[in-house]
């Protein structure tokens, strides 16, 4: 089955700048600003566009060693990014893949809203574990806030 979870979160960082840092340079930035959450990001194949496969490794003590993400779409004009978790982590006997969509929308106050959709593709009639969804959401929030804190302090970066 397919289970869809949608969330929204806000940032004080303008949409274009956040897209550049959080989406386009996340591979480089995440291990630097959130070493407690991401150990490394390695490009397995591709140049960042659709079809690119990345291996994200987690620090010791995490329940999972790594995940592999596949980039599905990068829309620089509308600040949209689609990717799928295709291997490692929770992917296995009961879960086929997780398709994720992130859209960053500018807000009148100069900040932005992140609209996030996570589709869990389970095998057969398996359900999605609530703690899996919660952990994924928390990881996303951790990375966003880590990037936001760095960008607030470095106004010259990612302009």
């Amino acid at each position: 089955g397919v289970f869809n979870y949608e969330t929204e979160t806000t940032s004080v960082i303008p949409a274009a700048r956040l897209f550049k840092a959080f989406i386009l340079d996340g591979d480089n930035l995440f291990p630097k600003v959130a070493p407690q959450a991401i150990s490394s990001v390695e490009n397995i194949e591709g140049n960042g566009g659709p079809g690119t496969i990345k291996k994200i490794s987690f620090p010791e003590g995490f329940p999972f060693k790594y995940v592999k993400d596949r980039v599905d779409e990068v829309d620089h004009t509308n600040f949209k990014y689609n990717y799928s978790v295709i291997e490692g982590g929770p992917i296995g006997d009961t879960l086929e893949k997780i398709s994720n969509e992130i859209k960053i929308v500018a807000t009148p106050d100069g900040g932005s809203i992140l609209k996030i959709s996570n589709k869990y593709h389970t095998k057969g009639d398996h359900e999605v574990k609530a703690e899996q969804v919660k952990a994924s959401k928390e990881m996303g929030e951790t990375l966003l806030r880590a990037v936001e804190s760095y960008l607030l302090a470095h106004s010259d970066a990612y302009n």
Epitope: V12, P31, K32, V33, Q36, R145, A146, S149, L152
Partner: antibody, heavy 119, light 104 residues
Framework: EVQLVQSGAEVKKPGESLNISCNGS????????IAWVRQMPGKGLEWMGI????????KYRPSFQGQVTISADKSITTAYLQWSRLKVSDTAIYYC????????????WGQGTLVTVSS | DIQMTQSPSSLSASVGDRVTITCQAS??????LNWYQQKPGKAPKLLIY???SLQSGVPSRFSGSGSGTDFTLTISSLQPEDFATYYC??????FGEGTKVEIT
Amino acid sequence: EVQLVQSGAEVKKPGESLNISCNGSGYNFTKYWIAWVRQMPGKGLEWMGIIYPGDSDTKYRPSFQGQVTISADKSITTAYLQWSRLKVSDTAIYYCARLGATYGGADYWGQGTLVTVSS
Amino acid sequence: DIQMTQSPSSLSASVGDRVTITCQASQSIVNYLNWYQQKPGKAPKLLIYAASSLQSGVPSRFSGSGSGTDFTLTISSLQPEDFATYYCQQSYAAFGEGTKVEIT
């Protein structure tokens, strides 16, 4: 045990060059930013800049840009703060610190290096 | 650059007193604020990170609160070893001017 050990006190003349060091141990040195912080005599703490030893990405506070150079050698887990021409106003204690807490809090600090510049 | 303004610059208090130090950012820094304690001749020590999270090993009498532009460090019951200078700091950036806590 995480430790940052700084080089010893220095007495220099104006116009001279200087390199002070900060050696990190007990953790993966390449994975955490190192910050340099200045404290002039009787004054507060001033953020100078940071370096990420993994790829030597460096960010300076605008007022210190061009005044000092921050570098690192990950092969010997050491960060450096360098001056090409010292001024009397560079007299201060310089601390290095590891940014290991969530959102870049400085969780471990070196003992400080006193730099005295006098003619 | 975002400016950090700390107040008061100094205060006198007695053992057992409740002490409050404030820090104001010139624009919103969300909750990306750290508090440090420094004793004479020593390196600073991290007390609070992310505005309200207590650093490991720091006594629970220290607490932090606030978000956006206004932040507070509270010492619920001042102990003899707490007489020191306290600094707020925007993560990855500037420190406040410091608050010296002295014995009355």
